[in-house]
């Protein structure tokens, strides 16, 4: 029950996180005009990853896309890439985790397969969250650097922009959304990985009872389950006829490195 709750909660938290990462990536307020200690203007500038906007009087807003790839700073391109990678990994992770949910039955899917998928989606969420956090942090660092350099525009050189009024930019709402969303995705991923442990069938403590017959030595192993993440063999309850040769179940009696997160 606790495993199902952990997995379900991990999925929901990751879902919220990925929705947040998508929202942050699409938002225009990555950097906003710094109003503190600046001449007060009747227009308000703010910029996103894809376009820059100017809000004039009476809420009249005009946005212009960055219709160039080569003219944009490498850092901005890197941030875009990190956010997109984060979204893609997160989306795949969500897809995988839906099928991995314990509360959803799909055919005769084994618990071991579900554990494997849960771990995979968990790792994907962790990487997705890290990508988002990294992307937002790189952008924030770029802002801080430019702020102290007092550049007139963050994307100087883009479209032959002239440095005129000292418009300084500070952290926009998208950065905070991105950080929180990345953190949630990361937490959700960790929860999925924790849930994976509980989902995986564990090795029982029963000793194998041997019955000696005249011709053959037949060992009956009542609970031969072991934790599997898909990297090992797909084991089931098996009757083991031990005629000198040992089955796969007996070969690996110690937990593998994939059994625990």
């Amino acid at each position: 029950m606790a495993v199902t709750a952990c997995q379900g909660l991990g999925f929901v938290v990751s879902l919220i996180g990925i929705a947040g990462i998508i929202a942050a990536t699409c938002m225009d307020q990555w950097s906003t005009q710094d109003l503190y200690n600046n001449p007060v203007t009747a227009v308000f500038n703010y910029q996103g990853l894809w376009r820059s906007c100017v809000r004039e009087s009476s809420g009249f807003t005009e946005c212009r896309g960055y219709f160039t790839l080569l003219g944009l700073p490498a850092m901005l391109q890197a941030v875009r890439a990190l956010m997109i990678v984060g979204i893609v990994l997160g989306a795949i992770g969500l897809l995988v985790s839906i099928f991995a949910l314990k509360c959803i039955r799909i055919g005769s899917m084994e618990d071991s397969a579900k554990a494997n998928m849960t771990l995979t989606s968990g790792i994907m969420f962790i990487v997705s969250g890290l990508c988002a956090i990294a992307g937002v942090s790189v952008f924030a660092n770029m802002l801080v650097t430019n702020f102290w350099m007092s550049t007139a525009n963050m994307y100087t050189g883009m479209g032959g922009m002239v440095q005129t009024v000292q418009t300084r930019y500070t952290f926009g709402a998208a950065l905070f959304v991105g950080w929180v969303a990345g953190g949630l995705t990361l937490i959700g991923g960790v929860m999925m990985c924790i849930a994976c442990r509980g989902l995986a069938p564990e090795e029982t403590n029963y000793k194998a009872v041997s019955y000696h017959a005249s011709g053959h030595s037949v060992a009956y192993k009542p609970g031969g389950f072991k934790a599997s993440t898909g990297f090992g063999s797909n084991t089931k309850n098996k009757k083991i006829y031990d005629g000198g040769a040992r089955t796969e179940d007996e070969v690996q009696s110690y937990p593998s490195k994939h059994d625990y997160v």
């Epitope: 525009n153 005129t164 009024v165």
Partner: antibody
């Protein structure tokens, strides 16, 4: 069509108070940034005050010479903007225009109301 | 505070003549965010409120005849009337619509010979 009509002007003694009103129609008043601009032979056209819309928290701005004496306010339910003027001086004399600031331009102006500060 | 200086203070012209008036701002009115100049031109006839002519330094307001042209960038701006008509006789004001206070220029009076 857009209309702005000022009222409340008149003769007032120095140090006195006066409240100007501007009734607007023909546009979504609650979205607009509203301004007061005055004109006198001595100073020409002079921007006095601005009040922004609800989305901009009804933020206000004033010219330095009236800061602390004049207060701009609005009532979106009545589509009206007001200018409360206290501690009036002779140099406040002039025609007061109510204007709408849209897209960084004063696109509509009222006919104006005259304020005379004299003893 | 930003100061808008207009020159000349008055212009005496004949009908059909081309006229140019200048407006200089003490600080650049060019916004780096959209590369737009926040300077506006108004026309005021006696006994009337000012009327919007040109905004964003060069964009003509709808209904304004195309003989009125605004140009310039940064701190130096110009209003040109290509062929002056009798109805164009008025005072022309430029205004900074970027920095507070949103100051107006001193005005240029257009008179007929």
């Amino acid at each position: 069509q857009v209309q702005l009509k000022e009222s409340g002007g008149g003769l007032v003694q120095p140090g006195g108070s006066m409240k100007l009103s501007c009734a607007a129609s023909g546009f979504t008043f609650s979205d607009a940034w509203m301004n007061w601009v005055r004109q006198s032979p001595e100073k020409g056209l002079e921007w006095v005050a601005e009040i922004r819309n609800k989305a901009d928290y009804h933020a206000t701005h004033y010219v330095e010479s009236v800061t602390g004496r004049f207060t701009i306010s609005r009532d979106d339910s009545k589509s009206s903007v007001y200018l409360q003027m206290n501690r009036l001086r002779a140099e406040d004399t002039g025609i007061y225009y109510c204007t709408r600031n849209y897209g960084s331009r004063f696109d509509y102006w009222g006919q104006g109301t005259t304020l005379t500060v004299s003893s | 505070d930003i100061v808008e200086t207009q020159s000349p203070s008055s212009l005496t012209v004949t009908a059909g003549e081309k006229v140019t008036m200048s407006c200089k701002s003490s600080q650049s009115l060019l916004n780096s965010g959209n590369q737009r100049n926040y300077l506006t031109w108004y026309q005021q006839k006696p006994g009337h409120p000012p009327k919007l002519l040109i905004y964003w330094a060069s964009t003509r307001e709808s209904g304004v005849p195309d003989r009125f042209t605004g140009s310039g960038s940064g701190t130096d701006f110009t209003l040109t009337v290509t062929s002056v008509q009798a109805e164009d006789l008025a005072v022309y004001y430029c205004q900074n619509d970027y920095f507070y206070p949103l100051a107006f220029g001193t005005g240029t009076k257009l008179e007929l010979k």
